[in-house]
């Protein structure tokens, strides 16, 4: 599997899931979020050879003919696979306010 | 939606499914398959700017993240959303099978 | 050079299943189709079955049907042949081969042969 | 299920030979789903003709294959030592495929 376990332990050119860091102040202009001040959200990239954990049987039919036509601009992308949330806390005022947000960390990736 | 109805009347930069016609002697050297003789399976390609068509809310906050952080590497790639099957017909011997082959026709695309 | 490469020899009781793969490489797995065949000094050869990889779609003798489950993993340009349900007859020499293209078809390459032998 | 009768079931050839070997279908098989095999003592089978007639790429032109409907044959045109084997035929134009018994072939 495309997954944190593997893709932070070796350096795969491939399609894996890649570590990223954001702070939600700096990054993405978020001042509502008191804490995390950040987190890995984490991207997945990297070529999709043939057969490289293909999704579907699109995904494996474009591979192959990506594979025996070189030429050809058509080909599958990495994106993300298993997406986990992530518990934020917030003010409302100066009341505290706990919220999960889901699809926000990215564990594992897949050629589409 | 990003789809065939929208894509192949609009002359789109960004993520769009695209028509793409596939061979399935020629292209994919599959000689089993007796009709059609081709199909079209069709791709998805295209930048994937703030916001357009984003999946999840990973893939909003990566292309928010990509719009403040220009020269990051990460962000959301154009893939597949609603893929539709296709029958096909083949032979057992001179017996005439049909089967219908999922996820095998791109409709539309997101960005993920 | 293309290259079918099998699971070693195999014992079992009767009643067991056995599980055979056959692992291509050397050409494009996904584009042929797999054969089984069988092969007894009583019977000689027997065609079990074909998969086409890419598509999962398994064609099956009739004589086979109901204990034998073909399969393949593109990801990994492996085919598998279980047989269940398994009686000293089926003591044998099990073959994948690839065809030249349709599902039955004639077989241009084959694996090295896989010796099951059924016994209690 | 089409039934495969080879004839002889076995024959001794001298170096230089030439030798036929036939293969009767029980039903019609039309023009092309008829394959040929070569199989020595301990190894894999090797195809030799497919679609009746078509040498597989490698095999010595010395081998030939003919016929349809129900009669087929293999030839070889002038027999070598590395041609002892056991020849199989095959046919593939109805579920299950069926092969022949087998005819070994020894060289004296």
């Known amino acids: 599997a495309l997954d944190t376990n593997y893709c932070f332990r070796n350096l795969e050119e491939n399609c894996c899931v890649r570590p990223l860091y954001i702070d939600f102040r700096q990054d993405l202009g978020w001042k509502w979020v008191h804490e995390p001040k950040g987190y890995y959200a984490n991207f997945c990239s990297g070529p999709c050879p043939y057969l490289r954990s293909a999704d579907t049987t699109h995904s494996t039919v474009l591979g192959l003919y990506n594979t025996l036509n070189p030429e050809a601009s058509a080909s599958p992308c990495c994106v993300p696979q298993d997406l986990e949330p992530l518990t934020i806390l917030y003010y409302v005022g100066r009341t505290p306010k706990v919220e999960q947000l889901s699809n926000m960390v990215v564990k594992s990736c897949k050629c589409s | 939606a990003l789809d065939t109805n929208y894509c192949f009347r609009n002359l789109e930069e960004n993520c769009c499914v695209r028509p793409l016609y596939i061979d399935f002697r020629q292209d994919l050297g599959w000689k089993w398959v007796h009709e059609p003789k081709g199909y079209y399976a069709n791709f998805c390609s295209g930048p994937c700017p703030y916001l357009r068509s984003a999946d999840t809310t990973h893939s909003t906050v990566l292309g928010l993240y990509n719009t403040l952080n220009p020269e990051a590497s990460a962000s959301p790639c154009c893939v597949p959303q609603d893929l539709e099957p296709l029958t096909i017909l083949y032979y057992v011997g001179r017996t005439p099978k049909v089967e219908q082959l999922s996820n095998m026709v791109v409709k539309s695309c997101k960005c993920s | 050079q293309v290259l079918l490469v099998q699971s070693g020899a195999d014992v079992r009781k009767p009643g067991a299943s056995v599980k055979i793969f056959c692992k291509a490489s050397?050409?494009?797995?996904?584009?042929?189709?797999i054969s089984w065949v069988r092969q007894t000094p009583a019977q000689g050869f027997e065609w079990m079955g074909g998969v086409i990889p890419i598509v999962d779609i398994a064609n099956y003798a009739q004589r086979f049907k109901g204990r034998l489950v073909l399969t393949a993993d593109t990801s990994t340009n492996t085919a598998y042949m279980e047989l269940r349900s398994l009686k000293s007859a089926d003591t044998a020499v099990y073959y994948c081969a690839s065809t030249l293209g349709l599902v039955l078809d004639a077989m241009d390459y084959w694996g090295q042969g896989s010796l099951v032998t059924v016994s209690s | 299920e089409i039934q495969m009768t080879q004839s002889p079931s076995s024959l001794s050839a001298s170096p230089g030979d030439r030798v036929t070997i036939t293969c009767r279908a029980s039903?019609?098989?039309?023009?092309?789903?008829l394959a040929w095999y070569q199989q020595k003592p301990g190894k894999v089978p090797k195809l030799l003709i497919y679609g009746a007639s078509s040498r597989a790429p490698g095999v010595p032109s010395r081998f030939s294959g003919s016929g349809s409907g129900t009669d087929f044959t293999l030839t070889i045109s002038s027999l070598e030592p590395e041609d002892a084997a056991t020849y199989y035929c095959q046919q593939y134009a109805d579920s299950p495929i069926t092969f022949g018994q087998g005819t070994k072939l020894e060289i004296k």
């Open positions: 039903q019609s098989l039309g023009s092309s789903y």
């Open positions: 050397g050409y494009t797995f996904t584009s042929n189709v």
